[in-house]
């Protein structure tokens, strides 16, 4: 019996087609992805093949103005229109709190939303009961397939799930649910979840009875053969893991941003064992037409976005200096504003010993593309912020050793004076450079804001200590020559859309007046 699994993950509000790098579509003839194009391909496969499941492994939320404006209603609407069969909860589904998940998505979705390792307690338990499930048994043809969900247990550090959701260890939580499915005579089981490729592989290895793992969170691109676009495969598709009980378990992920549709064909025997698995992600390029009815619906929903772009978010009473003449040479107040917003967006009081889990921010000056003039009645709009941060990136959480941070700050000024983009703006960091010294030895003082303290203060950076840092995904991926970050990072979790972080902060503050205050000397 053959099952076709179509899967997406980490779509991050890319409802409209995008450019090849998943930023805003400029030249439509070269654009990719989007729900209208996805629907065309899904329908084509549904017509051609008998047993098809369309699954999403989480993080539909967060990433473009679509989410900022519609707050998840767009996810429910278009996933319903595409007739998804199931979705796993990702960390970003909690970005607007539990209410921001329940009302727009859980109550509106016509498909099951799953996570076995999230347990509700207190008053939330009855409110959320039945709105998400640990597993769902789906009829497919004359067979049944069990889908068990899982979500990164790091979610409390990455999003805003509140205090009434407990995120358990994935493997510990999944095993009893899989066992329950087995007792219900469900012998074909897919683990669908959002904890990253390393955890996906561990689940395949450790959870007895899981036949296939469909993952997300790490934006992993797998491919067999010659890849069709710029993404470099982390391994073959599917990636085969040998389980502890001797089975070959296929593990898949489909990169991110709706650029690809994962396509996996699984052959099951009569006992539910996987006999064979093969496939590849399908690049959703312009050779696949956009479905006209979905496209028309997108255009209808788009109207509200254009109006939102020009509405006032808040005011500035100072010039926001985002000029390259400032931000690539010295501390600039636009850099300070953005870093303050980045830290504010990551306030999570999860431990009494820590005022916050992260206190530090770094930001490449070259990523700041425009100033904002206060002489326009001080008004700041989304449109203004899009000029400052035009690349559609995210502000991510990483863990780095102190020694890596020291290398990063040396790189920041290794060719100082040439107006290059690698000059770092900071938050929660005091750095002193001596530019008379030779490159690679210019950082003379590097103090960082403590986290395990009730009164935050600056202490010297320790080379062997592991620090959490918020930074643009561009830097996490080694951009602007920061190869040491990419090579030496110990953990990387993708965060919220850059403009959204800053716009939320400005809306919260109402009036802003960031200063140049001696963070960089």
């Amino acid at each position: 019996w053959e099952l076709t699994i179509l899967h997406t993950n980490d779509v991050h509000s890319r409802l409209e087609q995008t450019s090849e790098d998943s930023s805003k579509c400029v030249n439509a003839s070269r654009c990719m992805g989007g729900v209208a194009r996805l629907f065309t391909k899904v329908q084509q496969i549904r017509r051609a093949e008998p047993n098809v499941l369309l699954l999403d492994a989480g993080d539909q939320y967060q990433g473009t103005i679509w989410f900022t404006v519609y707050k998840g209603a767009e996810v429910a609407h278009f996933m319903n229109a595409l007739r998804y069969d199931a979705m796993a909860l990702g960390n970003h589904e909690f970005d607007n709190g539990v209410e921001g998940l329940i009302e727009p998505l859980l109550k509106e979705a016509k498909f099951p939303i799953l996570s076995a390792n999230i347990k509700a307690k207190g008053p939330l338990a009855s409110q959320i009961s039945g709105l998400y499930l640990p597993y769902k048994v789906l009829p497919v043809g004359d067979e049944v397939v069990g889908i068990v969900g899982y979500t990164s247990k790091e979610t409390p550090f990455l999003s805003n799930p509140g205090t009434n959701l407990v995120f358990e260890d994935e493997i510990t939580a999944l095993q009893p649910e899989v066992d329950k499915l087995k007792t219900l005579n469900v012998n074909k089981i897919i683990a669908l979840g959002h904890s990253g490729f390393e955890m996906d592989k561990l689940i395949a290895q450790k959870v007895r009875g899981v036949d296939v793992v469909v993952g997300g969170h790490s934006n992993t691109f797998l491919y067999t053969g010659n890849p069709p676009s710029k993404e470099v495969p982390a391994g073959k598709y599917p990636f085969i893991v040998t389980s502890d009980d001797g089975r070959k378990v296929p593990v898949v992920q489909a990169y991110a941003f709706g650029k690809y549709l994962g396509y996996l064909k699984i052959e099951f025997d009569e006992r539910g064992n996987v006999i064979s698995s093969h496939g590849n992600p399908i690049l959703l390029n312009s050779s696949i037409p956009e479905d006209p009815s979905i496209k028309a619906d997108i255009n209808k929903w788009r109207i509200k976005l254009d109006n939102y772009s020009t509405q006032e978010l808040g005011k500035t009473i100072v010039y926001l200096d985002g000029s390259s003449q400032s931000c690539r040479f010295r501390e600039c107040n636009m850099g300070n504003l953005i870093c303050d917003a980045m830290i504010n967006n990551n306030l999570r009081h999860t431990d009494e010993m820590f005022w916050n889990h992260v206190s530090m921010c770094i930001l490449n000056g070259g990523g700041i593309r425009s100033p904002i003039d206060e002489r326009n009645n001080g008004t700041i709009t989304w449109e203004n912020l899009a000029a400052v941060l035009p690349f559609g990136g995210t502000f991510d959480l990483v863990q780095l050793k102190g020694s890596t941070l020291k290398k990063a700050f040396e790189h920041s000024v290794h060719r100082y004076g040439q107006s290059t983009g690698e000059f770092l703006q900071v938050g929660g960091i005091h750095v002193v450079y001596d530019l008379s010294r030779k490159p690679g030895d210019r950082v003379v003082k590097l103090d960082v804001l403590c986290t395990k303290c009730r009164v935050p203060s600056y202490d010297p950076l320790k080379m062997d200590e592991v620090y959490k840092v918020i930074l643009p995904n561009f830097l996490a991926n080694g951009g602007d020559g920061f190869q040491m970050i990419k090579d030496e990072l110990l953990r990387h979790d993708s965060g919220d859309q850059d403009i959204n972080v800053v716009s939320t902060y400005i809306s919260k503050m109402k009036v802003i007046y960031p200063a140049v205050e001696g963070r960089i000397k």
């Epitope: 019996w1 043809g141 004359d142 067979e143 005579n185 040998t242 001797g246 070959k248 025997d269 009569e270 006992r271 064992n273 996987v274 006999i275 064979s276």
Partner: antibody, heavy 113, light 106 residues
Amino acid sequence: EVTLKESGPVLVKPTETLTLTCTVSGFSLSSYGIQWVRQPPGKLLEWLGVIWSGGSADYNAAFISRLTISKDTSKSQVVLTMTNMDPVDTATYYCAGQYGSVWGQGTLVTVSS
Amino acid sequence: DIQMTQSPSSLSASVGDRVTITCRASQDIGDRLNWLQQKPGGAIKRLIYATSSLDSGVPSRFSGSGSGTEYTLTISSLQPEDFATYYCLQYAGSWTFGGGTKVEIK
């Protein structure tokens, strides 16, 4: 639980027709095929034929003229019919799942007058 | 038709011994190979499917490997209950079996 059980006569006279039934439980014949295999005493396993989930059948070329495999999906039963039986057809007859994950216990059919 | 050549046809071994049985296909069968165990009573049980995946409840001392046309069943430490006849079965085309390997007590 996934099980297969063969049933039918233990003794068949030469030139007669053998009819064996394989009753399936734990899976659907609309999703999976059933294979038939036999093993003469002290000899090797020999594949006879298969009926697929869609209802079509394939046969070992050596038996194509006298073998028919059919099914009744609603009863979860597959029927093997072999005409013109001969003493050399004495064997244990097995039905098995399409992929060989499950086997019946086998039924010994003796062809003798 | 695809022919399967299995060797050895029989072997004598002691409890604790490592036993290896091989099967050669007349053409590439792309990992579509099972290993079956038949006990003296006639009951047939699949041990390994798709070349190397272990069936549920089968001890981990059994393992399978191979690709293309060459396939191997290994019993890492023979136990008393392992004395039986073993067959390879290819299902890339119409089923064909190897000639069997009878594992006897030395």
